[in-house]
Interface confidence: medium
């Protein structure tokens, strides 16, 4: 996260760190005790094998994510229409081998319901252990930052992303740059608060550089995927 | 949910398992038309920021809120399971319907041991004037940023 601040314990209790061989690779969001939402590009082959992955919840510092505190992943389900070139439908689910125990620091985020209206410039938050500057290293601490939703029409304009934004994507950030998600934040949450409840609006997907002017962050539009998510959960039940 | 698969026309609904399209009037009508039967297990949804429980009516080809009349938590549990939540039923309550809805799904308590949506019938009245708000999981709550002073 570029231009953010370190998170307090329990501020983003749905945020998980997804590790491969003891190294943070992507973020994710807890939606049930067993299911994590992340980005499909995080689990491209060969990382589509669940045994590669360990999820850490409720711990804000990477160096405290020691072996034994993590949750092994049992199943990885990437969206069937994910396109690795365009990053369209960039969403995936991970099912944990054993369910998380919810507590003050580990809680699920709400999936958005149909009929939820978002303002054109809705205030949202992003969080993750990604780089705090372009080409930087993974952050030791969980960071978070405020961003604004950017209308798709605006994000698709010639001077921003020139029609690369599909209905399965959502843009957030600031056209002047300075605040953005970055490498290592992928799969993590874009959330907003409505009715005193935090909703998962997006999963961190892609961008051109980090925090550059006219290059805001692009997120998977979770609203489009809720039906697919429920279907996977139901099919597994 | 928009039940519009990319392969189907605006009025058609796609079966996940086969990619075939079926008529909206066959969706949630009590008979499986998709090879995987998913046309009969995607019949409940939560709507809007207040988690209003809605059920798909195959007759009207649209979604309608569930009236609070005769509703109990057992039905809430069943609806959450229908959606894919396992053992995580949280709360069910009646809230005043401010959507101006004139069309409801009501519970037929005399219906046998059948899927939740099959116990529901179409009604233009709801005597409690309240609709079911259903939370399947205690989600979206964080610790207040204002930590207790030392």
């Amino acid at each position: 996260i570029v231009g953010g601040e370190s998170a307090l314990p329990g501020a983003w209790p749905w945020q998980v760190s997804l590790h491969v061989q003891n190294v943070h690779v992507c973020g994710g969001s807890i939606i049930t005790p067993e299911w994590i939402v992340t980005a499909a590009h995080c689990v491209e082959k060969p990382l589509n094998n669940p045994w590669h992955w360990t999820a850490f919840a409720g711990i804000l510092r990477q160096s405290f994510m020691f072996y034994g505190a993590g949750y092994q992943v049992e199943k990885v389900i990437s969206h069937p229409n994910y396109d690795s070139k365009t990053k369209n439908n960039d969403i995936a689910l991970m099912k944990l081998q054993k369910p998380l125990t919810f507590n003050d620091l580990v809680k699920p985020v709400c999936l958005p319901n149909p009929g939820m209206m978002l303002q054109p410039e809705q205030l949202c938050w992003i969080s993750g252990w990604g780089a705090t500057e372009e080409k930087g290293k993974t952050s030791e601490v969980l960071n978070a930052a405020k961003v604004l939703l950017i209308e798709t029409q605006r994000c698709n304009s010639r001077y921003v992303y020139d029609n690369l934004i599909t209905p399965a994507m959502i843009c957030a950030g600031f056209l002047q740059g300075n605040v953005d998600s970055c490498q290592g934040d992928s799969g993590g949450p874009l959330v907003t608060s409505k009715n005193n409840i935090w909703w998962l609006i997006g999963d961190t997907s892609w961008g051109s550089g980090c925090a550059k002017a006219y290059r805001p962050g692009v997120y998977g539009n979770v609203m489009v995927f809720t039906d697919w998510i429920y279907r996977q959960m139901r099919a597994d039940g | 949910w928009k039940f519009m698969g990319s392969k189907c026309s605006n009025s058609g609904i796609e079966c996940d398992s086969s990619g075939t399209c079926i008529n909206p009037s066959n969706w949630c009508d009590g008979v499986s038309h998709c090879p995987g039967g998913e046309d009969e297990n995607r019949c409940v949804r939560l709507y809007g920021p207040n988690f209003i429980l809605q059920v798909y009516s195959s007759q009207r080809k649209s979604w309608h809120p569930v009236c609070q009349d005769d509703w109990s938590e057992g039905y809430g549990r069943a609806a959450c399971q229908d959606m894919g939540y396992r053992n995580s039923f949280y709360s069910s309550q009646g809230i005043v319907d401010d959507s101006g809805s004139t069309s409801f799904m009501k519970l037929n308590t005399s219906a046998g041991n059948v899927d939740i949506y099959k116990k529901l019938y179409h009604s233009d009245a709801c005597s409690s004037k309240a609709v079911v708000s259903l939370r399947c999981i205690a989600c979206g709550v964080n610790l207040n940023s204002s930590r207790q002073s030392r």
């Epitope: 370190s6 998170a7 307090l8 314990p9 329990g10 409720g58 711990i59 804000l60 510092r61 160096s63 405290f64 020691f66 505190a69 125990t101 507590n103 003050d104 620091l105 580990v106 705090t132 952050s139 030791e140 601490v141 969980l142 | 610790l143 930590r147 207790q148 030392r150």
Partner: antibody
């Protein structure tokens, strides 16, 4: 105000076990972790491990695995440390101390009163 | 494990003078803009008391004559001007990774 009140001094025989308590008050018990620290007479401080009351999850310093077992009772906002197979090397003052968990900047902002343990036959 | 070496082991300072205590870590304890080094004061028969956290932040209620500095592997606690009540043992502690460890302590006496 924020306090950690520990159980009183104990004299125990070699080979025995002992459970020390640390009662928290003045803050939300489940928001912070409880750490345990050992100090032998005239010596420095050694970190034994932590427990997070929110979930009961623990982490032990390798050196104290098998020696110390950390538990909590949320209903009474009390943390416990069970010391087993005691020897003279375990004679020390044991402190409980509070720290942020997770963000775990890892410093101890509130300390218990200390429990003096003497192992002698 | 990260080893913390404190120096000197003891020092005697006159009232009103400056006391400087050093703590060297066997590897860097700084990352992501934070230095995970903390300082405590302990008087006989009492528990330690937090003075400085994250290398340079003064804990609330601690007098401003205490200050901390440093990054990477080298850290310093300064007390100026030293007062009578400052006679105690001072410990540094890191939390860069697990296990957390303390320095052996520096005993400050007044001349």
């Amino acid at each position: 105000q924020v306090q950690l009140q520990q159980s009183g001094p104990a004299l125990v025989k070699p080979g025995a076990s002992l459970k020390i308590s640390c009662e928290a008050s003045g803050y939300t018990f489940t928001y912070y972790s409880i750490n345990w620290v050992k100090q032998r007479p005239g010596q420095g401080l050694e970190w034994i491990g932590w427990i997070f009351p929110g979930s009961g999850s623990t982490y032990y310093n390798e050196k104290f695995k098998g020696k110390a077992t950390l538990t909590i009772d949320k209903s009474s906002s009390t943390a416990y440390m069970l010391l087993s197979s005691l020897t003279s090397e375990d004679s020390a003052v044991y402190f409980c101390a509070r720290s942020d968990y997770g963000s775990a900047y890892g410093y101890f902002d509130v300390w218990g009163t200390g429990t003096t343990v003497t192992v002698s036959s | 494990d990260i080893v913390l070496t404190q120096s000197p082991a003891s020092l005697a300072v006159s009232l009103g003078q400056r006391a400087t205590i050093s703590c060297r870590a066997s590897k860097s304890v700084s990352t992501s803009g934070y230095s995970y080094m903390h300082w405590y004061q302990q008087k006989p028969g009492q528990p330690p008391k937090l003075l400085i956290y994250l290398a340079s932040n003064l804990e609330s209620g601690v007098p401003a004559r205490f200050s901390g500095s440093g990054s990477g592997t080298d850290f310093t606690l300064n007390i100026h001007p030293v007062e009578e009540e400052d006679a105690a043992t001072y410990y540094c502690q890191h939390s860069r990774d697990l296990p957390l460890t303390f320095g052996a302590g520096t005993k400050l006496e007044l001349k």
